[in-house]
């Protein structure tokens, strides 16, 4: 766009002798600038297209030469389960809901000490339009929340089988499942055990070797022949989910303050929020940097607190 600027200056120079430029000349100059602008925009568009094409053209597939690596040690797993399972864990913290009643506001400061200061001052006079309103600052009384770890283990030895038809007696179906899932032609392998639940039409198949489950799971279905009818059962990964470190916590928010005493105000909530924000931004009012303000002048609102 620098070029654009230079061209404009050039045109201005050509048409700007020291003498006074008349209206006609002025109009002509604007027209010329507009034309030049359109021309430049087209040129930019063309160059951008070319650039995109060039980018595609210059994307290269490089065969990186083989690197010789020196293995210093072999990590021996403590037990077989490290090989037979894929583990992952998730930390889950619930958000704690708080209902802001009519005439209340929540203000969150960037710093804890500012929030504490605002609470300790308790009474604050906030100018809202032509009203000098006295609001009370209190800590936010929060309900209890929960925090826990979800520990997921995906087995490399087991699979879930569902949609098993109820066409055989339990012992026979167990044998039939083992027989079918041991067929290498279908990606199966030696079966260690079959846990079959006739009622739910599901089973857990445990294989002897690692890798068989992965092979079977490449397809979502598996053939199960019973008296010449091919039933297609559904296969899915076998996962075990454990809940760990379940904690219930409660307390008060360190950076958020509850403001009460705004019941009589009939104004737009956003305007009031801005005014509260402005008031509490000022150090002379005992405030500091504000993160967010949420005000309820009509219907109660739900605010969610998280760690």
């Amino acid at each position: 766009m620098e070029a654009d600027k230079d061209d404009t200056q050039q045109i201005l120079k050509e048409h700007s002798p020291d003498e006074f430029i008349k209206d006609e000349q002025n109009k002509g100059l604007i027209d010329e600038i507009t034309k030049k602008n359109i021309q430049l925009k087209k040129e930019i568009q063309k160059l951008e297209t070319e650039l995109q094409e060039a980018t595609k053209e210059f994307q290269i597939k490089e065969d990186i030469p083989e690197t010789k690596m020196k293995f210093l040690s072999v990590e021996t797993p403590e037990n077989d389960s490290q090989l037979s399972n894929i583990s992952c864990s998730f930390q889950v913290s619930s958000k704690v809901p708080y209902e802001i009643q009519k005439g209340q506001a929540l203000i969150t400061f960037e710093k804890e000490e500012v929030a504490q200061n605002v609470v300790s001052m308790s009474k604050h006079h906030v100018q809202i339009k032509d009203v000098n309103l006295e609001v009370t600052a209190k800590p936010v009384p929060l309900n209890s929340g929960v925090r826990f770890q979800v520990y997921v283990e995906v087995s490399k030895m087991k699979i879930n089988v569902t949609e098993i038809p109820d066409t055989l007696r339990e012992d026979q179906m167990r044998d039939k499942l083992e027989l079918s899932f041991s067929k290498s032609r279908n990606g199966g392998g030696e079966v260690d055990r079959v846990d079959y639940d006739r009622q739910s039409g599901s089973a857990v198949i445990t294989f002897v070797e690692i890798g068989v489950a992965d092979k079977i799971l490449k397809k979502k279905e598996y053939p199960l022949y019973i008296n010449q009818t091919c039933h297609r059962v559904t296969v899915s990964p076998y996962t075990e989910i454990h809940l760990k470190k379940y904690q219930i916590f409660s307390g008060t928010s360190k950076r958020t303050v509850l403001l009460t005493g705004m019941e009589g105000i009939q104004m737009d909530e956003e305007i009031v929020e801005d005014l509260i924000n402005i008031h509490f931004q000022r150090a002379k009012n005992g405030g500091g940097e504000v993160d967010v303000v949420k005000c309820s002048l009509g219907q109660p609102h739900i605010a969610y607190f998280e760690e």
Partner: antibody, heavy 124, light 112 residues
Amino acid sequence: QSLEESGGDLVKPGASLTLTCTASGFSFSSSYYMCWVRQAPGKGLEWIACIYAGSSGSTYEASWAKGRFTISKTSSTTVTLQMTSLTAADTATYFCAREYSYDDYGDFWGFNLWGPGTLVTVSS
Amino acid sequence: ALVMTQTPSSVSAAVGGTVTINCQASQNIYTNLAWYQQKPGQPPKLLIYGASNLESGVPSRFKGSGSGTEYTLTISDLECDDAATYYCQSSLYSRIADRANAFGGGTEVVVK
């Protein structure tokens, strides 16, 4: 691959006897049932019992054999048949046979491997 | 219980001829039928499984057919070596009963 029966003998009525079938060249797996079939002199084949060679070891007996004949898997290459309260009608050649599953495209079975048989004679 | 009825009990034919053995099941066996050949003093030998599939090494002169409850074994171009007793057999999975297994009564084939 072969099967061999042992334990056949001449016993008195009311006696018990255990027959053993030993597999060579293969070990039991999920693809078959190991079975016992008998044949009385000059008569036809009669199915006695089968045991699934897979992990469950499910057993199936002919209705007439229930309670008197028990099939069991004693190792990955041996199957036994325990017979009690034997009578003259139980005199026969007892075959051990492998019932194989041809179920790649269907639910087909066949006794594709047999032992030579062992003779059991029940006589006073 | 599963019952297999085999007919005839005996059949004779000349070398080069054809014999047909029938087998009837007491219930639908869904083509899960096998045929065996047994010679005196020997264990049976599997010829056909799944009603019509030839076991490896078995000559194509042996042909199985049928479905439902009716099955047939046809031996064509009879040879002296085909003289034996032939048995049909089926095993069946069930929803209500034990897995059943049964043999037919046998058919003696005499080659003249």
